[in-house]
Interface confidence: low
């Protein structure tokens, strides 16, 4: 009696069970009563990642440099290319179909978290006692110079954008 279900890694066709093609191979001919399933390996730039009966392999995803992407992991006959953003960019979506440049933190703000391949730079305002005088995607807020530790007097207080300005101690306080 013809089978109604087949074992794992088999498929039912013409009332008989045929072997699926292994990952990295595509189906050319179904099996017959006297021949095994005929499979062929995927070509360069193609892949199939499961036991299958596909007649065409899938194309490797193209990591388009014009969209800011690069290959993080080259695809094989059983895996797809993995695209990530080039340095200095992050994904515009979870699928990472394109990338945009990282944002910089303006003067008065420091980097709280450096951007990754999937998230943008996170900035924070410089708290009292700290400053940032540059626009940067990497620099944190830096502490004001403590003039007294250098034996100097503070001539101008620091702000969120500028460091304290030190000068010579007045010998006589008038």
């Amino acid at each position: 009696e013809p089978p109604t279900a087949c074992r794992e890694k088999q498929y039912l066709i013409n009332s008989q069970c045929c072997s699926l093609c292994q990952p990295g191979w595509k189906l050319v001919n179904d099996c017959t009563e006297v021949t095994e399933t005929e499979c062929l390996p995927c070509g360069k730039g193609e892949f199939l990642d499961t036991w299958n009966r596909e007649t065409h392999c899938h194309q490797h995803k193209y990591c388009d440099p014009n969209l800011g992407l690069r290959v993080q992991q080259e695809g094989t006959s059983v895996t797809d290319n993995i695209c990530v953003c080039k340095e200095g960019r992050h994904c515009t979506s979870k699928a990472c179909e394109s990338c945009v440049l990282y944002h910089s933190c303006s003067p008065g703000f420091g980097v709280k978290q450096i951007a990754t391949g999937v998230s943008d730079t996170i900035c924070e305002p410089c708290p009292v006692g700290f400053f940032s005088n540059v626009s940067s995607a990497f620099e944190k807020c830096r502490p004001w110079t403590r003039c007294e530790t250098k034996g100097l007097a503070e001539q101008q207080a620091g702000t969120d954008k500028t460091d304290a300005v030190c000068g010579p101690q007045n010998r006589l306080r008038l």
Epitope: G45, Q59, Y62, P65, L69, R70, V71, Q73, E74, E87
Partner: antibody, heavy 120, light 112 residues
């Protein structure tokens, strides 16, 4: 700027082993594939091996397959070529080179090379 | 393996004159993304190779615009519009279409 400095070359007898190193600087080493290419004295360039950025994929030329192994240590920012069962025909200058990636596949920056001489 | 051939194997050029080197591959280097995986390198005397052209026609950064690459499939050409004394050396084409990557035999360019 990108810099690649090979070391470990020298004179070695046939059948012996040698390990070449390539110290990288000036770029994010862990983001790039890396190659070894060799050049026998007075001859042309011969591609030897390539390794993907995180070591999952490596390919070797048939002439060295089973004898040479390309590897990398991203924490040390260094590329290696372990050469076993050396033959006289392996005598060459060995260059390490960075792969340009999807936008420029193939070696884009090259080191100055290290000479390996296999002789009895 | 893909076999690369070059012609001529030797070339002597007058400064200021154009020069052209041909490279052929035994299989197509055109990939489904529309790019040709063919690079050109120059190895100056006593130096390491340097990339001139990648993906058939993309000039590498810092390469003078007198160098240009063209062609598709199996036939490629490197042109130097006006040869200068510093252009002497051996020019290699290389296919990056599939492993093993393979180089052409090289074309030695001298100045007359």
């Amino acid at each position: 700027q990108v810099q690649l400095v090979e070391s470990g070359g020298g004179v070695v007898q046939p059948g012996r082993s040698l390990r070449l190193s390539c110290a990288a600087s000036g770029f994010t080493f862990s983001s790039y594939g890396m190659h070894w290419v060799r050049q026998a004295p007075g001859k042309g360039l011969e591609w030897v091996a390539v390794i993907s950025y995180e070591e999952s994929n490596r390919y070797h030329a048939d002439s060295v397959k089973g004898r040479f192994t390309i590897s990398r240590d991203n924490s040390k920012i260094t590329l290696y070529l372990q050469m076993n069962s050396l033959r006289t025909e392996d005598t060459a200058v060995y260059y390490c080179a960075r792969d340009g990636g999807i936008a420029a596949p193939g070696p884009d920056y090259w080191g100055q090379g290290t000479l390996v001489t296999v002789s009895s | 393996d893909i076999v690369m051939t070059q012609s001529p194997l030797s070339l002597t050029v007058t400064p200021g004159e154009p020069a052209s080197i041909s490279c052929r591959s035994s299989q197509s280097l055109l990939y489904s993304n529309g790019y040709n995986y063919l690079d050109w390198y120059l190895q100056k005397p006593g130096q390491s190779p340097q990339v001139l052209i990648s993906l058939g026609s993309n000039r590498a950064s810092g390469v003078p615009d007198r160098f240009s690459g063209s062609g598709s499939g199996t036939d490629f050409t490197l042109k130097i519009s006006r040869v200068e004394a510093e252009d002497v050396g051996v020019y290699y084409c290389m296919q990056a279409r599939q492993t093993p990557f393979t180089f052409g035999p090289g074309t030695k360019v001298d100045i007359r």
